[in-house]
C-alpha cells in the first residue's frame, strides 16, 4: 500500500513539475524591467527565452520573436537547451512511469519489470528537475551580472548633455515557476526511486510452507526472514492445496503492504 502511494504521489508530483517546466519555458516573463529606482516609463519591457515583449501604458502589448539563432547569446542558447532537455526527459519519464504504476496492470508484467521502469522514470525525473533548476539558475545568474553592469553604466559616462537611460532587468515570474517546477520534478523523481525499492525483489522469494506433524506444530520456513518482509512477488494469498501445508501468507494474520492493490 505504502509503495503504491509513494509511486502514485511521485508520479503526480512529477507530472505537476513537468507541466510547470513546460509553462516556464513558454512564458515570456523570464526577465522583467526593473521599476525600482528607475525613471517612470510609459512602457514595460519583459523578455522570455523565445521573444521579447513591450506593454505600453494603453495596455497594447507587442512581442517580437528572436528570429536569429546564431546572433543569440550562448548563455541563452544553453538555457534553452537545458529546459528542452528537461522537458524531453520529463515527458519520457512520464510515459515510462505510467506503465510502471502498480495500479495499472499491463498483461503479465512482472513486478521486477515495474520496479526497473519505476527506477528509470525516477532517474529521468531527477535529471529533468536538475536540468530545469540549472537552466533557470544560469539565466538568473546572467540577469544578476547584467543588472550590476547596467547599474554601473547608469552612473558613468554622463558627461555629455544627452543621457541614455539603461533598461535594467530583474527576475521574472518564469524563474520562480521554473525553480518550483524543477524542485517538484526532482522530489517526484526521488519518490519514484524510493517506491522502486519497495517493488524490487531482492532475492528469489520461495513459498514458505509449514508442515504440520501429527503431534507437534513445527513450521519449516525456508528463506529466513525474506518470507515475511512483504517485498516478494506474491501479491495474492493462494492456497497450495487443502491439506496440512499452508502458505506463509496464510499463517500471518496481519495484512501485507500489497493486500489492497
Amino acid at each position: 500500500m505504502a509503495v503504491t502511494a509513494c509511486q502514485g504521489l511521485g508520479f503526480v508530483v512529477s507530472l505537476i513539475g513537468i507541466a510547470g517546466i513546460i509553462a516556464a519555458t513558454c512564458m515570456d516573463q523570464w526577465s522583467t524591467q526593473d521599476l525600482y529606482n528607475n525613471p517612470v516609463t510609459a512602457v514595460f519591457n519583459y523578455q522570455g527565452l523565445w521573444r521579447s515583449c513591450v506593454r505600453e501604458s494603453s495596455g497594447f502589448t507587442e512581442c517580437r520573436g528572436y528570429f536569429t539563432l546564431l546572433g543569440l547569446p550562448a548563455m541563452l542558447q544553453a538555457v534553452r537547451a537545458l529546459m528542452i532537455v528537461g522537458i524531453v526527459l520529463g515527458a519520457i519519464g512520464l510515459l515510462v512511469s505510467i506503465f510502471a504504476l502498480k495500479c495499472i496492470r499491463i498483461g503479465s508484467m512482472e513486478d521486477s519489470a515495474k520496479a526497473n521502469m519505476t527506477l528509470t522514470s525516477g532517474i529521468m525525473f531527477i535529471v529533468s528537475g536538475l536540468c530545469a533548476i540549472a537552466g533557470v539558475s544560469v539565466f538568473a545568474n546572467m540577469l544578476v551580472t547584467n543588472f550590476w553592469m547596467s547599474t554601473a553604466n547608469m552612473y558613468t559616462g554622463m558627461g555629455g548633455m544627452v543621457q541614455t537611460v539603461q533598461t535594467r532587468y530583474t527576475f521574472g515570474a518564469a524563474l520562480f515557476v521554473g525553480w518550483v517546477a524543477g524542485g517538484l520534478t526532482l522530489i517526484g523523481g526521488v519518490m519514484m526511486c524510493i517506491a522502486c525499492r519497495g517493488l524490487a525483489p531482492e532475492e528469489t522469494n520461495y513459498k514458505a510452507v509449514s508442515y504440520h506433524a501429527s503431534g507437534h506444530s513445527v513450521a519449516y520456513k525456508p528463506g529466513g526472514f525474506k518470507a515475511s518482509t512483504g517485498f516478494g512477488s506474491n501479491t495474492k494469498n493462494k492456497k497450495i492445496y487443502d491439506g496440512g501445508a499452508r502458505t506463509e501468507d496464510e499463517v500471518q494474520s496481519y495484512p501485507s503492504k500489497h493486500d489492497y492493490v
Epitope: Q33, P39, V40, T41, A42, V43, N45, Y46, Q47, S52, C53, V54, E56, S57, S58, G59, F60, E62, R64, V162, Q163, T164, V165, T167
Partner: antibody, heavy 120, light 113 residues
C-alpha cells in the same frame, strides 16, 4: 465617432477648488487610459495627469501632485480632475485626451477643452 | 523630467515649399525592448485642440496626408512638411511618450511666406 466633451471650467478665486469632467462617447471608455493636458493662454501644452483603464496606475506632473486628483467612472463613461488650492498660474484651457491603443502611447483624440480662470 | 527642445520657434515657408521642424530630447526616446522611438507630433490650429499627426517618430496617424513625414531616432527628431499647403498653417508640438511626465516641446509656429 469618438467624442470627448469637457465641462466644469469657469472663474474661480485663488485657493478655491474646481472639478472638471470629461464625458466620453463613441468608444469603449473602460478599455482606454485617459489624460488631462492643459494650455495656458498663448503658451504651449503641459501634460497634467494620466489614469489607466482600471484606475491604476495614476501619474501626475510633479508640481501638481497633492493639489490635483484624477479619477474616472467607467460606468458613467466619465473622467474627472479635482483641482484644489488653485493658483493664478493654473489658468489654462484643460483638455482631456485618450491614450491611443497601438500608437506608442500618443494621445489620439482630444476634447475641445474647458477654460479655467483663476483670478481674484 | 525629459526636456524637449524644438527649433525654430517660428517658420515662414512659401506654398509648395518644404518646411522642416527639429525636436531634441534630453534623453533617448528609443525603447531598447522593441527598438521603437516614443515620440509624437501634434498639429494645433488656432482655437482648436491638438491633433495627432505622427506617432512612434515616423508612423502617420490614419487620415494624415503623406506630405507629413516624421524621422529621427534616439534624441534627434524631425517633422517635414514636404509641400506646404495653406491648411498646414498651425503650431506643431513634439512630445515625449516614453517617460512620465509626458513632456511637450514649446511648439513651432508655421506660417506662409
Amino acid at each position: 465617432e469618438v467624442q470627448l466633451v469637457e465641462s466644469g471650467g469657469g472663474l474661480v478665486q485663488p485657493g478655491g477648488s474646481l472639478r472638471l469632467s470629461c464625458a466620453a462617447s463613441g468608444f469603449t471608455f473602460s478599455s482606454f487610459g485617459m489624460h488631462w493636458v492643459r494650455q495656458a493662454p498663448g503658451k504651449g501644452l503641459e501634460w497634467v495627469s494620466y489614469i489607466s483603464s482600471g484606475s491604476s496606475p495614476i501619474y501626475y506632473v510633479d508640481k501638481l501632485k497633492g493639489r490635483f486628483t484624477i479619477s474616472r467612472d467607467n460606468a458613467k463613461n466619465s473622467l474627472y480632475l479635482q483641482m484644489n488650492s488653485l493658483r493664478a498660474e493654473d489658468t489654462a484651457v484643460y483638455y482631456c485626451a485618450r491614450a491611443g491603443y497601438a500608437v506608442r502611447n500618443a494621445l489620439d483624440y482630444w476634447g475641445q477643452g474647458t477654460l479655467v480662470t483663476v483670478s481674484s | 523630467d525629459i526636456v524637449m527642445t524644438q527649433s525654430p520657434d517660428s517658420l515662414a515657408v512659401s506654398l509648395g515649399e518644404r518646411a522642416t521642424i527639429s525636436c531634441k530630447s534630453s534623453q533617448s526616446l528609443l525603447n531598447v525592448g522593441n527598438q521603437k522611438n516614443y515620440l509624437a507630433w501634434y498639429q494645433q490650429k488656432p482655437g482648436q485642440p491638438p491633433k495627432l499627426l505622427i506617432y512612434g517618430a515616423s508612423t502617420r496617424e490614419s487620415g494624415v496626408p503623406d506630405r507629413f513625414i516624421g524621422s529621427g531616432s534616439g534624441t534627434d527628431f524631425t517633422l517635414t512638411i514636404s509641400s506646404l499647403q495653406a491648411e498646414d498653417v498651425a503650431v506643431y508640438f513634439c512630445q515625449n511618450d516614453l517617460f512620465y511626465p509626458l513632456t511637450f516641446g514649446a511648439g513651432t509656429k508655421v506660417e506662409i511666406k
